[in-house]
C-alpha cells in the first residue's frame, strides 16, 4: 500500500481467481483513543472499533472510503483504491491501445517545435467517474522540472457503438534550450482513476522524436505566362522555431488530380516555392518536415489549382 | 578554424546535411525498438552532447562560434573512431554497401574541414566498449547511430545557420 | 521504381557453363550490392554470394566457390552470375537480389528468377 | 556456417487459425532474422526484418518475435491467401543463410 495523496492510498493486488489479498491496517487520524467505530463508504454498518482498523483486500467491495467516528462525528477518512496486477502485467483497462508507432502506446504526445511544449493525448471509452492527473519532468534520476495544465476532454467520438473520449494535457520545460542536443529523455506519468480502480501510464520521449510541425501556410499559386506551369510558393507556419536560418525544415510538394487513383509525383525540396504543371481540377499539397532530424511530416497544405 | 579563424561555412553546411541523410539510411527506423529501455539513462552519457553553454544556439555563434565549432569536431572526432570500430565491423555482417562506411568516411572529412593540418585541438578519450555478442553489438550500434542522428542534426544547423548569417 | 530482370530459362549439358544476366533500373546500379540465391526444385533457399559493382568485388558463399563467378557491367546495369562444369544437381531457379539501404542482408527486391536446366 | 533450422516442415491449418512457425539458430544471431513468404511458382516476398519489424505492406496478422538463436512467425488469423511456403533466413554472418523451409497447407 503507498500513498497517491493525503487521505488516498492505493492497495496493490496480485489478481487472480482465489488471491489472498493484502492487509491493511487503517489508523484514525485523532488524538481520541476510544470510541472509534469504522464505516465503509455511506453504509452505516460497523466495521470494527478502535484506533485501528485491519482489513483484507482482496476485490473492490473492499475498496472505497473508510470513515472513523466518534460520538456520530466523522474523526477522518482513509479512501483505498485497487491496483490490479495480472500475470505480473499491470492493469490497463481504462485507457485505449492507440496501437500507433506501435503496441501498448496508451499515450501520445507531439510537439509543433523546439521550445520544449507538448501535448500529449489518450483515449478512454468511460464517460463518468473518472478522474487524471498528470506529473513530468526531463530525465528520472536527477529530474529537471516540466509543468503541466489541467487535463481537458478535448474530443468525443462515436465507434461503431461506442463514444471514445479523447483527454489531453498541455506541458512545458520550465528550462528549455532548443538548439541543445537532447540528452535525457522527457518522462510523462498519468495516474488514472476510474471508480475505485487506480492506473498508471508512462510516455518517454525526446522531443526531437515527437516534433511535428504545423503545415506550411500562405500557400500562393501565381501561373507563368504562356505557360501551363505555375509558381508555386509557401511559407514556414507560424508555430515553427525560429530563426528559419538555424531551425530548417524541408517541403514535399504534390499535385493531386481529381482521382485518387491518379499517380502522384512527389517533389522534396528546401526551398519555399516551385513551378509545377497544374491541371484545371487538380490541386497543389505541400506537407513539412525538419530539415536534418526524420521526425513527423506536417499534415498537407492544399490549394486548388483553378 | 582554430585560433578564431571562419571555417568554410557553405562546404561545411553541404557535409553536415550528407551527414543527417546518412545516419537516417543508416539506422531508419524510428522506435523500432525502444533503446532506451535498455540500460536506460547511463547508457550514452559518454558520447559527446552539444549542451547548452556550448554555445551553438544561434546567439552563441554570433557571439563566437568558436566554442561551438571545438565541440562539435570532437563529437565528430569520437563518432568516426566508433564506426570504425568493431562494433560495427563484427558481426551482425553489415555489407559494403552499407551507408555506415559512407558516414564514417563524411565524419572525417568534415572534422578535417574544421580543423586543418597542423591544428591540434586536444580530443577527449575515445571509450573502447568492444561486446562480444552480436546481440549487444547491434544494440550498442541502434544506440550510437541514433545519438549520432540526433547529434549530426544539430551540427548541420549551425552550420547552415553559420553559411546563411557569418559567411564574410 | 526498383526492378531487376533476369534472362530467360536455359537448357544446358553437363560439363558445360551458363551465364545468366540481371538488368537493374530505379537505383543507382553502383550503390548497391547485388545478391544470388539458389532454389533447387522443390528445395529451400541458398545463398551463394554477391557483387559490388562500386568496386567489382564479389563475395562468395564458400559452397560455391570455384562453381560460381559473379561480375557487374556498370554501363548496362547489368549483373552476371556464370556457373562452369555444370552438374546436374545445378539444375535450379537462380535469383538476383538487393538489400536493404541500410546495409544488412536482408532482400527487398528479386528479380523474376531464371530457371537452369542441366541435362544430358 | 549457421544453420537454421525451422519447425515444421509443413503444417495444415484452417481458415481463422493462429499458426506459428519456429526457427533456430546453431548460434546468437542477435535479431538478424528475416522473414520471407514464397507462394507457389512465384518470387520469395519479405515479409519481416530484424525479428519483428513488418516490412511494408504487409499485414498485422503476420508478427515475428525472438532473439538469440530462437525465433518464431506467427500469423494471427489465417487467410486463404497464406498459403505459401515460409523461410528464415540469418543475415548476421557470411555466407547468410536460409531454413529449410515450412509448407503451409489450408485444411
Known amino acids: 500500500i503507498w500513498e497517491l495523496k493525503k487521505d488516498v492510498y492505493v492497495v496493490e493486488l496480485d489478481w487472480y481467481p482465489d488471491a489472498p489479498g493484502e492487509m491493511v491496517v487503517l489508523t484514525c487520524d485523532t488524538p481520541e483513543e476510544d470510541g472509534i467505530t469504522w464505516t465503509l463508504d455511506q453504509s452505516g454498518e460497523v466495521l470494527g472499533s478502535g484506533k485501528t482498523l485491519t482489513i483484507q483486500v482482496k476485490e473492490f467491495g473492499d475498496a472505497g472510503q473508510y470513515t472513523c467516528h466518534k460520538g456520530g462525528e466523522a474523526l477522518s477518512h482513509s479512501l483505498l483504491l485497487l491496483h490490479k496486477k495480472e500475470d505480473g502485467i499491470w492493469s490497463t483497462d481504462v485507457l485505449k491501445d492507440q496501437k500507433e508507432p506501435k503496441n501498448k502506446t496508451f499515450l501520445r504526445c507531439e510537439a509543433k517545435n523546439y521550445s520544449g511544449r507538448f501535448t500529449c493525448w489518450w483515449l478512454t471509452t468511460i464517460s463518468t467517474d473518472l478522474t487524471f492527473s498528470v506529473k513530468s519532468s526531463r530525465g528520472s534520476s536527477n529530474p529537471q522540472g516540466v509543468t503541466c495544465g489541467a487535463v481537458t476532454l478535448s474530443a468525443e467520438r462515436v465507434r461503431g457503438d461506442n463514444k471514445e473520449y479523447e483527454y489531453s494535457v498541455e506541458c512545458q520545460e520550465d528550462s528549455a534550450c532548443p538548439a541543445a542536443e537532447e540528452r535525457l529523455p522527457i518522462e510523462v506519468m498519468v495516474d488514472a482513476i476510474h471508480k475505485l480502480k487506480y492506473e498508471n501510464y508512462t510516455s518517454s520521449f525526446f522531443i526531437r522524436d515527437i516534433i511535428k510541425p504545423d503545415p506550411p501556410k500562405n500557400l500562393q499559386l501565381k501561373p507563368l505566362k504562356n505557360s501551363r506551369q505555375v509558381e508555386v510558393s509557401w511559407e514556414y507556419p507560424d508555430t515553427w522555431s525560429t530563426p528559419h536560418s538555424y531551425f530548417s525544415l524541408t517541403f514535399c510538394i504534390q499535385v493531386q488530380g481529381k482521382s485518387k487513383r491518379e499517380k502522384k509525383d512527389r517533389i522534396f525540396t528546401d526551398k519555399t516555392s516551385a513551378t509545377v504543371i497544374c491541371r484545371k481540377n487538380a490541386s497543389f499539397s505541400v506537407q513539412a518536415q525538419d530539415r536534418y532530424y526524420s521526425s513527423s511530416w506536417s499534415e498537407w497544405a492544399s490549394v486548388p489549382c483553378s | 578554424v582554430p585560433g578564431g579563424s571562419s571555417p568554410a561555412w557553405a562546404q561545411c553546411q553541404q557535409l553536415s546535411q550528407k551527414l543527417c541523410t546518412l545516419a537516417w539510411s543508416a539506422h531508419p527506423l524510428v522506435g523500432h525498438m525502444d533503446l532506451r529501455e535498455e540500460g536506460d539513462e547511463e547508457t550514452t552519457n559518454d558520447v559527446p552532447h552539444i549542451q547548452c553553454g556550448d554555445g551553438c544556439d544561434p546567439q552563441g555563434l554570433r557571439d563566437n562560434s568558436q566554442f561551438c565549432l571545438q565541440r562539435i569536431r570532437q563529437g565528430l572526432i569520437f563518432y568516426e573512431k566508433l564506426l570504425g570500430s568493431d562494433i560495427f565491423t563484427g558481426e551482425p555482417s553489415l555489407l559494403p554497401d552499407s551507408p555506415v562506411g559512407q558516414l564514417h568516411a563524411s565524419l572525417l572529412g568534415l572534422s578535417q574541414l574544421l580543423q586543418p593540418e597542423g591544428h591540434h585541438w586536444e580530443t577527449q578519450q575515445i571509450p573502447s566498449p568492444s561486446p562480444s555478442q552480436p546481440w549487444q553489438r547491434l544494440l550498442l550500434r541502434f544506440k550510437i547511430l541514433r545519438s549520432l542522428q540526433a547529434f549530426v542534426a544539430v551540427a548541420a544547423r549551425v552550420f547552415a545557420h553559420g553559411a546563411a548569417t557569418l559567411s564574410p | 521504381q526498383v526492378q531487376l530482370v533476369q534472362s530467360g530459362a536455359e537448357v544446358k549439358k553437363p560439363g558445360s557453363s551458363v551465364k545468366v544476366s540481371c538488368k537493374a533500373s530505379?537505383?543507382?546500379?553502383?550503390?548497391?550490392?547485388i545478391h544470388w540465391v539458389r532454389q533447387a526444385p522443390g528445395q529451400g533457399l541458398e545463398w551463394m554470394g554477391y557483387?559490388?559493382?562500386?568496386?567489382?568485388?564479389?563475395k562468395y558463399n564458400e559452397n560455391f566457390k570455384g562453381k560460381v563467378t559473379l561480375t557487374a557491367d556498370k554501363s548496362t546495369s547489368t549483373a552476371y552470375m556464370e556457373l562452369s562444369s555444370l552438374r546436374s544437381e545445378d539444375t535450379a531457379v537462380y535469383y538476383c537480389?538487393?538489400?536493404?539501404?541500410?546495409?544488412?542482408?536482408?532482400?527487398?527486391?528479386w528479380g523474376q528468377g531464371t530457371l537452369v536446366t542441366v541435362s544430358s | 556456417d549457421i544453420q537454421m533450422t525451422q519447425s515444421p516442415s509443413s503444417l495444415s491449418a484452417s481458415v481463422g487459425d493462429r499458426v506459428t512457425i519456429t526457427c533456430k539458430a546453431s548460434?546468437?544471431?542477435?535479431?538478424?532474422v528475416a522473414w520471407y513468404q514464397q507462394k507457389p511458382g512465384k518470387v520469395p516476398k519479405l515479409l519481416l526484418f530484424?525479428?519483428?519489424t513488418r516490412h511494408t505492406g504487409v499485414p498485422d496478422r503476420f508478427s515475428g518475435s525472438g532473439s538469440g538463436t530462437d525465433f518464431t512467425l506467427t500469423i494471427s488469423s489465417l487467410q486463404p491467401e497464406d498459403l505459401a511456403d515460409y523461410y528464415c533466413?540469418?543475415?548476421?554472418?557470411?555466407?547468410?543463410?536460409f531454413g529449410q523451409g515450412t509448407k503451409l497447407e489450408i485444411k
Open positions: 537480389a538487393i538489400p536493404d539501404r541500410s546495409g544488412y542482408a536482408w532482400f527487398i527486391y
Open positions: 530484424w525479428a519483428s
Open positions: 557483387i559490388y559493382p562500386r568496386d567489382d568485388s564479389p
Open positions: 548460434r546468437d544471431v542477435a535479431i538478424a
Open positions: 530505379g537505383f543507382t546500379f553502383t550503390d548497391q550490392t
Open positions: 533466413h540469418q543475415y548476421s554472418s557470411y555466407p547468410f543463410t
